[in-house]
């Protein structure tokens, strides 16, 4: 069960894992997205471009991810279930100017041991 804003799709659950989606504006061409649990960086993905629109992805923490033109989704297979944690995304925009860094809205996630029922409270 997920409580909170019904149209917020930051978290989704499947196969015992959690997909956490971090949205960004479609106009952004080059960016770095970080996923935090509290103060810990869990995942980091950088998308850069070259001439001829060649795209390069840097994924130094080897997270499972899916990249679209307006979001980065990270897949956590064994999320910490010992206690509720606050997850949020941090976005750095390199292109187009100006350079920006911002924390995106996050959510508080509690996963019961069974991982069959999840409670989510959103902090926007």
């Amino acid at each position: 069960e997920i409580n909170g804003s019904a149209d917020h799709r930051m978290f989704s659950f499947h196969n015992g894992g959690v997909q956490i989606s971090c949205k960004y504006p479609e106009t952004v061409q080059q960016l770095k997205m970080r996923l935090f649990r509290e103060r810990e960086v869990l995942c980091e993905l950088t998308k850069t471009k070259g001439s001829g629109n060649a795209v390069s992805i840097k994924n130094p923490m080897l997270c499972l991810y899916h990249l679209s033109n307006n979001s980065v989704s990270f897949f956590l297979n064994n999320p910490d279930s010992s206690q509720g944690s606050y997850y949020f995304c941090s976005l750095s925009i390199f292109d187009p100017p100006p350079f920006q860094e911002r924390n995106l809205s996050g959510g508080y996630l509690h996963i019961y041991e069974s991982q069959l029922c999840c409670q989510l409270k959103l902090w926007l």
Epitope: Q30, T46, G50, F99
Partner: antibody, heavy 124, light 107 residues
């Protein structure tokens, strides 16, 4: 302290080759896109070539395309420029420069740290 | 390719005066991919402004950039002795290109 130190310049005859190196210290080298920029003494600046964080994406000024090759070795914190079929008009001071954002891209980014340059003289 | 023209070629001013440097592009510089650099004799260029108007880290607030499209301006509010140098504008969208420079010297 960030340092970029170029080497490998010298005097070479037209049609000859040189390999320039740029040794980086004080930074996480693979976080940065890198470029070579040259300057004829007493004249303006000309961007020569750029490379992204892992060497996947490269680009060249029309004036050097097909003659120069940019590469990098992240394990050695080094950037290179292989210069073949050199011409008198390639005579210049060659600078390496990193991308300002730490984006890993050379594309659509300004340059902040520059080395002090290495002089290439092409003369018969 | 986008060609940049800088004016004036040389600007002779006294310390404390205001300097206004112009950079004009042959076609619109998309998303304000425009930077300004300062270069002193025997030194490498130093990034001052990027994105047409954002000051780079550590750059004093007497330096400001403005403009969009094809017309850009670098303003130095009150010239300090260390500001006398050559200033280059650069468009860094796609293949980077630099202007020919404006020399700011002491009157």
């Amino acid at each position: 302290e960030v340092q970029l130190v170029e080497s490998g310049g010298g005097v070479v005859r037209p049609g000859g080759s040189l390999r320039l190196s740029c040794a980086a210290s004080g930074l996480t080298f693979d976080d940065y896109g890198m470029s070579w920029v040259r300057q004829v003494p007493g004249k303006g600046l000309e961007w020569v070539s750029g490379i992204n964080w892992n060497g996947d994406n490269t680009d060249y000024a029309d004036s050097v395309k097909g003659r120069f090759t940019i590469s990098r070795d992240n394990a050695k914190n080094s950037l290179y420029l292989q210069m073949n079929s050199l011409r008198a008009e390639d005579t210049a001071l060659y600078y390496c420069a990193r991308d300002y954002y730490g984006s890993g891209s050379y594309y659509n980014v300004p340059f902040d740290y520059w080395g002090q340059g290495t002089l290439v003289t092409v003369s018969s | 390719e986008i060609v940049l023209t800088q004016s004036p070629g040389t600007l002779s001013l006294s310390p404390g005066e205001r300097a206004t440097l112009s950079c004009r592009a042959s076609q619109s510089v998309s998303s304000s991919y425009l930077a300004w650099y300062q270069q002193k004799p025997g030194q490498a260029p130093r990034l001052l402004i990027y994105g047409a108007s954002s000051r780079a880290t550590g750059i004093p607030d007497r330096f400001s950039g403005s403009g969009s499209g094809t017309d850009f301006t670098l303003t130095i509010r009150r010239l300090e002795p260390e500001d006398f140098a050559v200033y280059y504008c650069q468009q860094y969208g796609s293949s980077p290109f630099f202007g020919p420079g404006t020399k700011v010297d002491i009157k």
